[in-house]
Interface confidence: low
């Protein structure tokens, strides 16, 4: 099967896992390391770049450990001694949840991203080309582990949402209530957390993430699509994601899909050409059986301005259109906080996104 | 190396009941899908449910649904299937197969993952 | 239901032959369908799936093709350990998999 060029990925690999890098590092390679803190046993796991099996010589140890208030530690082992520790004493990691860990190699550094946000920057101390070997041990199981070669073009860069010299702080939000859409549904006091309005550069493709504190709408020129974001923490019951937006002229169709992995666990599809709204579930690359009802007519209108709310819930997604209720889509996916990445595409243009 | 190894089969009166076991080994039953597959004697394959436990998603065939339950221990990193109402038509080899969890490119390269390991099988007799 | 018609439900075939097995799905399943071998008393082992990807360690003799809802197994050379009950399955929702009826290739 094709990879376009890049090594084939480890698939569900039992921890601790020790596996080859073929043709060691290089510049511009990016190893994504897709798993989930187990909640029970343990309160470290470790990713090693590594030269060998031996674990004597560790170009790079990424060691999250859930203790004293949780903390990161990297460092380099040569000939089984180990270096200064760097501390980073902020914890993205939370046990018994999903993560992607992403490691970009440079020439000067390895960029470390947690759930598609910068997280360190670890200036090599031995050469990196030493590297042929990732091992990853400790309390974790692994999805996966795959390789994107510096040579390839993914669609989706998972570097591309922030750039390196940004890097992103998230302060807690403040207590109290979160603005909503007049009068839908029951206003659910959401649980203090991190809500992200997402706003774009000038440059094209330059996205990054800004606190929002509280939600409001910012001026600024359209996103770029498709629009890929994460949503940190996933779904939960109260989590709220708002969008709003114009649907292009000549508008055929446009989504709103809400992804666990390599699945869409909820698939929002205005069909201009159907005059329908067609709501599924994407599991291994297949569709279900789609849900088209409304109470209403199609609330879409071609070269009309729109907002969308999608309120999670226990059992269901509430999805409103221009503050009024339209339909409740069953959790077909019922693990939420792995739903976890947003994407929109289509005809449309995006003014605003918060998860 | 990858492993499933069913065990819990035997003989049943019909309108009892029978749990399946699948023991994995060399993979993470959680980042996978588990997945039965009977085959009656002398008979071709007949899938009967399915389980990611990452996702928290599981489905039945309609032959089997409202009678049996697939779950999984990701701790001990087994699958099961409880079987109750059994019927004499139930009787068959049941396998647990795996079906990989996999890199979100792959999706974008239009790759459909099917049942790589298998389980050796093992035999439910419901008769009276 | 998605429906699996598999055809011949079996077949003679002599060491070398070509051999062509096909399998109609009654809507579309993309390219959502993989083969299986079997043998008596054993488990089926993958040998395709995507409709036309190879799994790691099967020969090369093996391949599988998609032309619509109409899809194919060929063995280009059959060999001895060939003689088997092939079946294809498709998975294009996780509630809808179905396998074929199967097709056993005996020696002639």
């Known amino acids: 099967m094709a990879f376009s060029g890049s090594q084939a990925p480890y698939l569900s690999p039992a921890v601790p896992f020790s596996g080859t890098i073929q043709g060691g590092l290089q510049d511009g390679l990016q190893i994504t390391v897709n798993g989930t803190v187990l909640s029970s046993s343990g309160t470290r796991f470790a990713v090693n770049f590594q030269t060998g099996f031996s674990g004597n010589d560790i170009a790079f140890h990424f060691n999250p450990r859930f203790e004293d208030g949780g903390y990161v530690v990297c460092n380099t082992r040569q000939n089984g001694s180990w270096g200064p520790e760097e501390r980073k004493t902020h914890m993205p990691f939370q046990k018994g949840m999903p993560f992607d860990l992403c490691f970009l190699v440079q020439s000067s550094d390895f960029k470390v991203m947690v759930n598609g946000i910068l997280f360190v920057q670890y200036f090599h101390r031995v050469p990196f080309h030493r590297v042929d070997t990732i091992s990853v041990n400790g309390s974790v199981q692994l999805s996966y582990i795959s390789f994107q070669n510096p040579r390839t073009v993914p669609v989706q860069p998972a570097f591309s949402t922030v750039p390196f010299s940004q890097p992103v702080c998230f302060p807690p939000r403040p207590r109290g209530r979160r603005q909503k859409p007049p009068g839908v549904w029951p206003a659910n006091p959401a649980p203090i957390t991190q809500t992200v309005i997402h706003t774009v550069q000038s440059a094209p493709g330059q996205m990054f993430s800004t606190p929002a504190i509280p939600p409001m709408m910012y001026p600024h020129p359209a996103y770029p699509m498709p629009f890929i974001t994460t949503i940190l923490g996933g779904l939960y019951p109260s989590k709220s994601i708002l969008l709003s937006g114009t649907v292009l002229p000549s508008a055929q169709r446009f989504h709103i899909n809400l992804c666990s992995g390599n699945h869409i666990a909820f698939h929002l599809n205005p069909r201009f050409d159907e005059n329908a709204v067609v709501r599924n579930t994407q599991i291994d690359n297949s569709w279900g059986s789609e849900e088209r009802s409304l109470p209403r007519k199609m609330p879409f209108v071609r070269g009309q301005s729109f907002s969308v709310w999608i309120l999670c819930e226990a059992h269901c997604l509430k999805v409103a259109v221009d503050g009024q209720h339209l339909f409740e889509y069953y959790h077909r996916l019922r693990n939420l906080p792995t739903i976890n990445r947003l994407e929109v595409g289509g005809d449309i243009q995006l003014t605003h996104v918060q998860t | 190396e990858v492993q499933l190894v069913e065990s819990g089969g035997g003989l049943v009166q019909p309108g009892g009941s029978l749990r399946l076991s699948c023991a994995a080994s060399g993979f993470t039953v959680y980042s996978s899908s588990i997945h039965w597959v009977r085959q009656a004697p002398g008979k071709g394959l007949e899938w009967v449910a399915s389980?990611?436990?990452?996702?928290?998603?599981?489905s039945y065939a309609d032959s089997v649904k409202g009678r049996f339950t697939i779950s999984a221990d990701t701790s001990k990193n087994t699958a099961y299937l409880q079987m109750n109402s059994l019927r004499a038509e139930d009787t068959a080899v049941y396998y647990c197969?795996?079906?990989?969890?996999?890199?979100?490119?792959?999706?974008?390269?239009?790759?459909?993952?099917?049942?790589?390991?298998w389980g050796q099988g093992t035999l439910v007799t419901v008769s009276s | 239901d998605i429906q699996m018609t598999q055809s011949p439900s079996s077949l003679s075939a002599s060491v070398g032959d070509r051999v062509t097995i096909t399998c109609r799905a009654s809507q579309s399943v993309s390219s959502a369908v993989a083969w299986y071998q079997q043998k008596p008393g054993k488990a089926p082992k993958l040998l395709i799936y995507?409709?036309?990807s190879l799994y790691s360690g099967v020969p090369s003799r093996f391949s599988g093709s998609r032309s619509g809802t109409d899809f194919t197994l060929t063995i280009s050379s059959l060999q001895p350990e060939d003689f088997a009950t092939y079946y294809c399955?498709?998975?294009?929702?996780?509630?809808?998999?179905?396998f074929g009826q199967g097709t056993k290739v005996e020696i002639k």
């Open positions: 399955q498709q998975s294009y929702f996780p509630s809808l998999v179905t």
């Open positions: 389980i990611y436990p990452y996702y928290g998603y599981t």
């Open positions: 197969a795996r079906k990989i969890f996999w890199p979100v490119s792959w999706m974008w390269q239009g790759y459909y993952p099917a049942l790589d390991y």
């Open positions: 995507s409709a036309s």
